[in-house]
Interface confidence: low
Amino acid sequence: EAHKSEIAHRYNDLGEQHFKGLVLIAFSQYLQKCSYDEHAKLVQEVTDFAKTCVADESAANCDKSLHTLFGDKLCAIPNLRENYGELADCCTKQEPERNECFLQHKDDNPSLPPFERPEAEAMCTSFKENPTTFMGHYLHEVARRHPYFYAPELLYYAEQYNEILTQCCAEADKESCLTPKLDGVKEKALVSSVRQRMKCSSMQKFGERAFKAWAVARLSQTFPNADFAEITKLATDLTKVNKECCHGDLLECADDRAELAKYMCENQATISSKLQTCCDKPLLKKAHCLSEVEHDTMPADLPAIAADFVEDQEVCKNYAEAKDVFLGTFLYEYSRRHPDYSVSLLLRLAKKYEATLEKCCAEANPPACYGTVLAEFQPLVEEPKNLVKTNCDLYEKLGEYGFQNAILVRYTQKAPQVSTPTLVEAARNLGRVGTKCCTLPEDQRLPCVEDYLSAILNRVCLLHEKTPVSEHVTKCCSGSLVERRPCFSALTVDETYVPKEFKAETFTFHSDICTLPEKEKQIKKQTALAELVKHKPKATAEQLKTVMDDFAQFLDTCCKAADKDTCFSTEGPNLVTRCKDALA
């Protein structure tokens, strides 16, 4: 129903705390360079205004749209052009163009320093002094680095953060209590970020229909006992929620997500038998829990998929009468039978089925033509299964760091023109798939591996779009989202690449590397590895291993030396010479 004042409506629905958090996230995602204090001031002004509208919905400006209200606030920031350049031009436009313009200026890779966690004592002190400000800083810092982070989910992670600090700051050894717990939250939040970015990419590039297909497949896997009408309703609602969040309408998004969670909990009987424990939780935890709830038990009695979609004499008639509905039921029926497949694979199969019907239903004898369609799925299914097996075997053999290095070599050979920091970031993220997925039971590996890889490769594509340098990457990123991962996997050494000259300074290291945390040390070594491959794209695995082992030995020796600086300055050049020789 229409409300006289949209801002009053959302304030009432969400409550002050969530309202303020979401407005802060929205501003931080739009204007990523502003300080926390600048945004906090705007948030307070918006909140005060919302309260006046709650008191009197007819008060001045209360009838304005949220985009108008928020956009006017952002455009009133002093020095907008100096700090944000052409983003300031957005302020010359009217809504809805102004908001679209803001969205287009979101930066997926802002030049902000990494979000450093303060040491435990300092963190606990500032948390105790002002928990609200502390959590505000967290929302601001994460949101501006991840401008498409799913806002209601970020509120959930802030709540987790808050609970961890409350618990650990009361303990004697704060550090050992905080570190593993906060690391866990950080890891989950980073995965959540790339997954949501993929959803927004799907929405932005291919529209709501593409996202809805993704949602139908995912929901059908999770809720195989729900009927098609129920799945369609949930997919439609979920599409609306995600469209709103991807579009910057964070208050509507969070409100609608809460409504969807409420609906699911009120209709458990027709959705799934696994929802009760989620539904017993408070709002943020409930919605988060529902989003990753375990799959319901599959019905024991599902008939063969062939009955309705291959053997039925009416296949072409049913398809012609309502293409989207017929393909939707195919996707639903296939997905509910295959919780062991990735959503990407299910969408590829649905696409193959659609293409087959398009071709066959125009022929003289359609059943003879489409009769083998299910058999034609086989190679599409085998390819990701082989990918999982090969990569998980390699991960088990090498461990996470070694597996990342193997991927780094592979991807540097596929796209040597891509910047080394991007290649290292991508390989480190892709390499985490081993730890994340290869330890799972067999039937959960494929969906975990492929859907995670797809999300990481989506980020590679987004970063590459800003400065396209590799035809290989452009080719894979231009196709449909579900074809990207197979496209990247199929890439081989880029034969068009002219190897980089060998520069000694690229492989020259100093004693400061010894004091770096393990993660930073790994990044330094992986940077060197990528540069080696760029110098010798056809180097064998054996040659690269020799060089990297030598390099590791060199670091170990010099970092243990009494006079580290002398060791680095004398042994460094020797290492460089040995590297050149090994790769000659």
């Epitope: 019905p299 024991a300 009695d301 599902l302 008939p303 063969a304 009955a307």
Partner: nanobody, 115 residues
Framework: QVQLVESGGGLVQPGGSLRLSCAAS????????MSWVRQAPGKGPEWVSA????????RYAESVKGRFTISRDNAKKTLYLQMNSLKPEDTAVYYC????????GSQGTQVTVSS
Amino acid sequence: QVQLVESGGGLVQPGGSLRLSCAASGFTFGSFGMSWVRQAPGKGPEWVSAIDSGGADTRYAESVKGRFTISRDNAKKTLYLQMNSLKPEDTAVYYCTIGQSTSRGSQGTQVTVSS
């Protein structure tokens, strides 16, 4: 060509027992859940019982719970329904189906419970 052939029906007194069999061919029997469905004279089909592909998960209509037992032998490609404590209202044509469909794909076998 998918074929399902039921057998084992007959005339039995109330309280008696029967064991129905369904021989399957033309499809990978061991990959599919199976059901028993019945149709009494002048009535629509009624789902009776289902079993998953491996035989671990079984389900029954309320009207037969505790009296009927569904089972399968994948090696023999055969589905069974053991019916004990039969009642006159169990009188119907019984047929087996792939999945939990109530659409008839076979001739069925007549079960009559009468004194």
